[in-house]
Interface confidence: low
Amino acid sequence: LEVQVPEDPVVALVGTDATLCCSFSPEPGFSLAQLNLIWQLTDTKQLVHSFAEGQDQGSAYANRTALFPDLLAQGNASLRLQRVRVADEGSFTCFVSIRDFGSAAVSLQVAAPYSKPSMTLEPNKDLRPGDTVTITCSSYRGYPEAEVFWQDGQGVPLTGNVTTSQMANEQGLFDVHSVLRVVLGANGTYSCLVRNPVLQQDAHGSVTITGQPMTFP
């Protein structure tokens, strides 16, 4: 029995619902009474959801899963996972048994967009060309870990003297803090780009130092 799932990971935003697609080709005369369907976590074999003896056996996964009962007879064994969390990320196996059996695994990639970065400057007054300043770029509650890029006003990457730290909160979402130490020129714009590598989503923050005053776009 051939069981088909998407090759690419399913990407789901934290808090939204995700559909893990799985399908099989029912033979003529197939009835749901013959179907045994099991969704389980690939690595631990933990039961997620099952269908047997013509009945939906329900969710064994925090009551956040559901099948598409009206579509099962057409060979659609997809699983709906509600209110996706970071902890849900991983591989799920769809196991279908009628007379013979087949299985396939689908990967769930969880993502959350990063907030617009907030920019802080230290020191933040009486600045003169030649002073060394510390610019901190902070962005919150994203997933997975961000890629952080700094650029000057001409779009040239600034790679020296950058320290980036990322810490996960209790939901597994990351707060990112990136610190750039730079010697001031006569004036300049310093931009921080926080990129979510899964969503291909960029969050921008910048600070412009023009002697006095500073502006935070």
Epitope: V11, P113, V156, P157, P197, L199, Q200, Q201, D202
Partner: antibody, heavy 114, light 110 residues
Framework: EVQLLESGGGLVQPGGSLRLSCAAS????????MSWVRQAPGKGLEWVAG???????YYADSVKGRFTISRDNSKNTLYLQMNSLRAEDTATYYC????????WGQGTTVTVSS | QSVLTQPPSASGTPGQRVTISCSGS????????VHWYQQLPGTAPKLLIY???RRPSGVPDRFSGSKSGTSASLAISGLQSEDEANYYC???????????FGGGTKLTVL
């Protein structure tokens, strides 16, 4: 000055292959995601493929399995290997920086015809 | 047929304000940032608006971008004859796992 220069276009028969190159200068090529976008004569823009700075690749459904995007950071060059070419692949191909193409090349023309 | 829908044409007279729309879904515009491109006749496109509402240096402040729900808009105020061009919206699509362009809008300055 940031510049992208495409090359490798030309006339090829259906089913044939072609490799496009894009030479980058004026920026730290290895740090940037790069893309290919095409435009058929008289038509709109179509994103073809993208490659992350870490070399993960993405493709439009229309070219999946036929086209391969790659990069050589030591040469500051982006490539698009095009196999099993079809008439509908006829277009001007542009390379660009980032997936959202903040810098574009001037384009190279690919014609697929017998 | 593009997943991102733009009107095929738009027009205005010099000095007018013109808006071009771009409609998508929760998988693209609804969750991702939108970019706009200008393509003058016979030239390569150029980035006009990025990250929904930001202008690259050199782009006049007559051009502005915005987004609401699953739709985005490009506004051009004080329309000038040199604004006559094709305009494209674009964004990432989470379901297709690829970057998408709208079908394009041909702007005519009357």
């Amino acid at each position: 000055e940031v510049q992208l220069l495409e090359s490798g276009g030309g006339l090829v028969q259906p089913g044939g292959s072609l490799r496009l190159s894009c030479a980058a200068s004026g920026f730290s090529f290895s740090n940037y995601d790069m893309s290919w976008v095409r435009q058929a004569p008289g038509k709109g823009l179509e994103w073809v493929a993208g490659i992350r700075s870490g070399s993960r690749t993405y493709y439009a459904d229309s070219v999946k399995g036929r086209f391969t995007i790659s990069r050589d950071n030591s040469k500051n060059t982006l490539y698009l290997q095009m196999n099993s070419l079809r008439a509908e692949d006829t277009a001007t191909y542009y390379c660009g920086r980032y997936f959202n193409m903040d810098v574009w090349g001037q384009g190279t023309t690919v014609t697929v015809s017998s | 047929q593009s997943v991102l829908t733009q009107p095929p044409s738009a027009s205005g007279t010099p000095g007018q304000r013109v808006t071009i729309s771009c409609s998508g879904s929760t998988f693209n515009i609804g969750t991702n940032l939108v970019h706009w491109y200008q393509q003058l006749p016979g030239t390569a496109p150029k980035l006009l608006i990025y990250l929904t509402d930001r202008r690259p240096s050199g782009v006049p402040d007559r051009f502005s971008g915005s987004k609401s729900g699953t739709s985005a808009s490009l506004a051009i105020s004080g329309l000038q004859s040199e604004d006559e061009a094709n305009y494209y919206c674009a964004t990432w699509d989470d379901s297709l796992n690829s970057f998408l362009f709208g079908g394009g809008t041909k702007l005519t300055v009357l």
